[in-house]
């Protein structure tokens, strides 16, 4: 049967019927329902929500909806022994203590089981010592401290402001610098937008608000005790000493009221420049230690959290494909939250729920997609992408053979300014074409397309008249699908104006104030941005699952490969003498990119011309498109990061959230001037160029005529 025979809705109306069925009011109701109590991973409340979603997805009409459970390492504060930080005097007396909880928002005063702010997976400990302020605790911040300012963090407690990079990278950097503890805080410069009130009167962070979050450095491993394999009933678990990615020093987060008390006493060196100063009324001195009268006072951390193997539950829904049931298009987003999850994740989960309902409505009317659609409600994303990774580990053989695409669906909004898309280049044309067909929800763009408002507000830095689409990094559930398995992936959400709002993320991220009311009052009262995101995510899934020829354009990969090759070459050319000395050449990489470009062009011509009524040829061409992303996977992985296997993209070694292109070469070149053995270091650069060139060439050959 052709896909048209699998439906009683005419093909022209398929997508329209699906999109028209999506309703803002439903998303609003679902968001309300999902945010009334906390849904922390590993808790009974989150298990109950999993069962509710399972039941509702069945009602919506999916063919099957199952729970997939795993027993993974999670982390919780000790209920009877709270975490806090003190300033102690020379006698050891605590003269100041940080707060033990966030003041609850109005209407939530009597809610139980609000987990207090903590850094998940922090080891226990009570270190005391002098404080050093390390700005954002980025690699370059520690370079500034150690190499330029000659400040030694060894044996110190460091205080770092949240923002710019993933908190796990901050902790890793502090550990490498020899720190014995880390205090993370939210500075108003990054989490308080000028001219906006604090919650509950606006969307800014109040002084008592604190960002929770995990501080792991998993590098794609999933459950720290079962890297590479599912944490099932018969799993062999590593001992805690061998667990992947756990921090070795105590870490704790605080709000800016408490941070003020610590930072106002700082002595030592003045900050190096304006980029180290936040918005508190403190000097932002770096230290080490307190100034003058306070120089005998120290900081002491009291951390008593515990790591526990705990059961988590994914919800996996299936809508079987009519023509190619063995080809999977996956829409997944997480369900677990730190507290209420008003934005993260439930603004995304509510959108997924409505997408499932719409697909279910079409199915009840007799329609089926061409390919199978899998819907996932992931657990324990906040604890290191654990639910999605364990499920993918369990199903890796199926996924690597059958996975067409993965669309991520975490927070639908982080602002209400314009669209933000990160995806594989294979999806660029799909996203462009889809957004040209959707209406913009933006004020001043009535009657205009989403593509038009997006392009106007977020223009591509390279191509005029086109919108910015970013590289995929990590920090969300697409990681295992894209970085490990090589399944074409994408994500979309509404975002802030990055030009005018310099704070990191959104101010109330991972705080108790991320409530339904935050969204309904301040971000999206009409839920029109949520609806638009539902249309983008759902529209992408629809096209990927239903189009006869997969909506991937391999020529867009050719374009970015050339751009990335130019970029990495220019980085290397900052060392012309060494390149000459060690005979470093990028010729092989540029040659491979050239071959890829030519072969991709010829493939695209064949794609226009082939007989689409021949199911064997159609399947063959679609398989070449599906497996192209897979061809960029190196089975050996990146150096010291075996679960990051994509040669073109990986999460930055310095910021998990950011994507890096040609990461193997990039990391080999990074800080190469400081390496003790230049010959060995440049040898590794050459090896990484070889790996990249081979991989690009091998990928190109998958697009060649098969015989």
């Amino acid at each position: 049967k052709s896909s048209n025979e699998a439906t009683n809705i005419t093909p022209k109306h398929n997508m329209k019927a699906f999109l028209d069925e999506l309703k803002a009011e439903n998303i609003k109701k679902f968001l309300y329902n999902f945010t009334q109590i906390p849904h922390l991973a590993g808790t009974e409340q989150n298990f109950q929500l999993a069962k509710q979603i399972q039941s509702q997805w069945k009602e919506f009409g999916l063919d099957s909806v199952e729970l997939a459970h795993y027993d993974v390492l999670l982390s919780y504060p000790n209920k009877t022994h709270p975490n806090y930080i003190s300033i102690i005097n020379e006698d050891g007396n605590e003269i100041f203590n940080t707060s033990l909880f966030e003041p609850p928002p109005p209407g939530y005063e009597n809610v139980s089981d609000i987990v207090p702010p903590f850094s998940a997976f922090s080891p226990q400990g009570m270190p005391e010592g002098d404080l050093v302020y390390v700005n954002y605790a980025r690699t370059e911040d520690f370079f500034k401290l150690e190499r330029d300012m000659k400040i030694n963090c060894s044996g110190k407690i460091v205080i770092a402001r949240y923002g710019k990079v993933f908190r796990g990278n901050k902790v890793k950097n502090a550990q490498l610098a020899g720190a014995k503890g880390v205090i993370l805080y939210s500075d108003p410069a990054d989490y308080f937008a000028p001219g906006v009130k604090s919650y509950p009167d606006g969307w800014n962070l109040p002084g008592g608000g604190v960002q929770r979050g995990n501080i792991l450095n998993l590098n794609g491993a999933g459950d720290p005790l079962t890297p590479g394999y599912p944490a099932n009933e018969y799993a062999y678990r590593r001992g805690i000493a061998e667990a992947v990615g756990l921090p070795s020093i105590p870490v704790h987060p605080i709000g800016y009221y408490d941070a003020q008390k610590l930072l106002e006493k700082m002595g030592g060196s003045a900050p190096p420049d304006s980029s180290w100063r936040g918005s508190l009324k403190v000097p932002y001195n770096v230290g080490p230690g307190f100034t003058g009268n306070f120089s005998t006072q120290k900081v002491k951390m009291h951390i008593h959290s515990t790591n526990e193997v705990t059961r988590i539950y994914n919800v996996i829904g299936t809508l079987r494909g009519a023509v190619e049931p063995d080809r999977y298009v996956i829409l997944g987003g997480h369900r677990d939250s730190w507290v209420f999850g008003g934005i993260d994740p439930q603004s995304g989960a509510a959108v997924v729920h409505e997408i499932v309902r719409s697909f279910g409505t079409l199915k009840k009317e007799g329609w089926r997609p061409r390919r199978t659609i899998l819907f996932a409600s992931w657990d324990a994303e906040e604890f290191g992408l654990l639910g999605s990774t364990e499920w993918a580990e369990e199903n890796s053989r199926l996924l690597q053979e059958r996975g067409v695409a993965y669309i991520n669906a975490d927070s639908s909004i982080e602002g209400n300014y314009t669209l933000r898309v990160d995806c594989t280049p294979l999806m660029y044309s799909l996203v462009h074409n889809l957004t040209k067909e959707l209406k913009s929800p933006d004020e001043g763009f009535e009657g205009k397309s989403l593509y038009e408002s997006w392009t106007k507000k977020s223009p591509s830095p390279e191509f005029s008249g086109m919108p910015r689409i970013s590289k995929l990094g990590s920090g969300n559930d697409f990681e295992v699908f894209f970085q490990r398995l090589g399944i074409a992936s994408g994500r979309a959400r509404y975002t802030k104006n990055w030009e005018t709002n310099k704070f990191s993320g959104y101010p109330l991220y991972h705080s108790v104030y991320e409530t339904y009311e935050l969204v309904e009052k301040f971000y999206d009262p009409m839920f029109k941005y949520h609806l638009t995101v539902a249309q983008v995510r759902g529209g992408m899934v629809f096209e990927l699952a239903n189009s006869i020829v997969l909506p991937f354009d391999c020529r867009d990969y050719a374009v970015v490969l050339r751009k990335y090759a130019d970029k990495i070459y220019s980085i290397s050319m900052k060392h012309p003498q060494e390149m000459k000395t060690y005979s470093v050449s990028f010729d092989s990489l540029f040659s491979a990119v050239k071959n890829f470009t030519e072969i991709a062009s010829k493939f695209s011509e064949r794609l226009q011309d082939f007989d689409k009524s021949n199911p064997i040829v159609l399947r063959m061409m679609n398989d070449q498109l599906m497996f192209l992303e897979r061809a960029f996977i190196d089975p050996l992985g990146l150096p010291d990061r075996p679960f990051y296997r994509h040669v073109i993209y990986a999460p930055s070694s310095h910021n998990k959230y950011a994507g890096e292109s040609f990461p193997g070469i990039y990391d080999a070149l990074f800080d190469i001037e400081s390496k003790v053995d230049p010959s060995k270091a440049w040898g590794e650069v050459k090896r990484q160029i070889y790996v990249a060139a081979f991989t690009v060439q091998a990928a190109a050959e998958t697009l060649s005529e098969v015989a």
């Epitope: 030592g268 420049d273 100034t291 003058g292 400081s674």
Partner: antibody, heavy 115, light 107 residues
Framework: EVQLVQSGAEVKKPGASVKVSCKTS????????IHWVRQAPGQSLEWMGN????????TYNQKFQGRVTITVDKSTSTAYMELSSLRSEDTAVYYC????????WGQGTLVTVSS | DIVMTQSPDSLAVSLGERATLSCRAS??????VDWYQQKPDQSPKLLIY???TRHTGVPDRFTGSGSGTDFTLTISSLQAEDVAVYFC?????????FGAGTKVEIK
Amino acid sequence: EVQLVQSGAEVKKPGASVKVSCKTSGYTFTEYTIHWVRQAPGQSLEWMGNINPNNGGTTYNQKFQGRVTITVDKSTSTAYMELSSLRSEDTAVYYCAAGWNFDYWGQGTLVTVSS
Amino acid sequence: DIVMTQSPDSLAVSLGERATLSCRASQDVGTAVDWYQQKPDQSPKLLIYWASTRHTGVPDRFTGSGSGTDFTLTISSLQAEDVAVYFCQQYNSYPRTFGAGTKVEIK
């Protein structure tokens, strides 16, 4: 070997501006703070401001009331100091120095302000 | 602004003898103090940073000490090449400020 090479001496009229350059070599340019310091004839040293070449973050001595601008060109590993609305008391030797602790110094540039 | 007061203004010491230079800050600066040497018609050179750490290549006859408001640079055995003006500088707060200098001569 770390080297900071400054541009040559300048003679300026009051009210004019001067831009002094400082070309660095022998180290990773983005790694060290660049400071500008001046020394009037027979006098002590006076700190004018600094810049982080990695991100362009600056701090200035408020005494110069917005008259001083420090910039960098990463592509040439060069720092610049521009002083505007010159007056006779700005006559001095202007030094660039690399490193938070002024680890390495340029040779100095004499700027003479005279009508 | 923090005022750095150096004393004495000048100091004459016999070759091989000890020279002790003082620098006082108008408020507590912790150990955020550097010492520089400037020879006639030359750029200054860094000697001591963080009050007591010798910069690379600086002879061990130069020693820095002190914290809070009182700092000392000691030249344990004066050599002919040590004739110069010595400046202290604080970097505990902006603007960074220098002392007026101590001129060291041979007696």
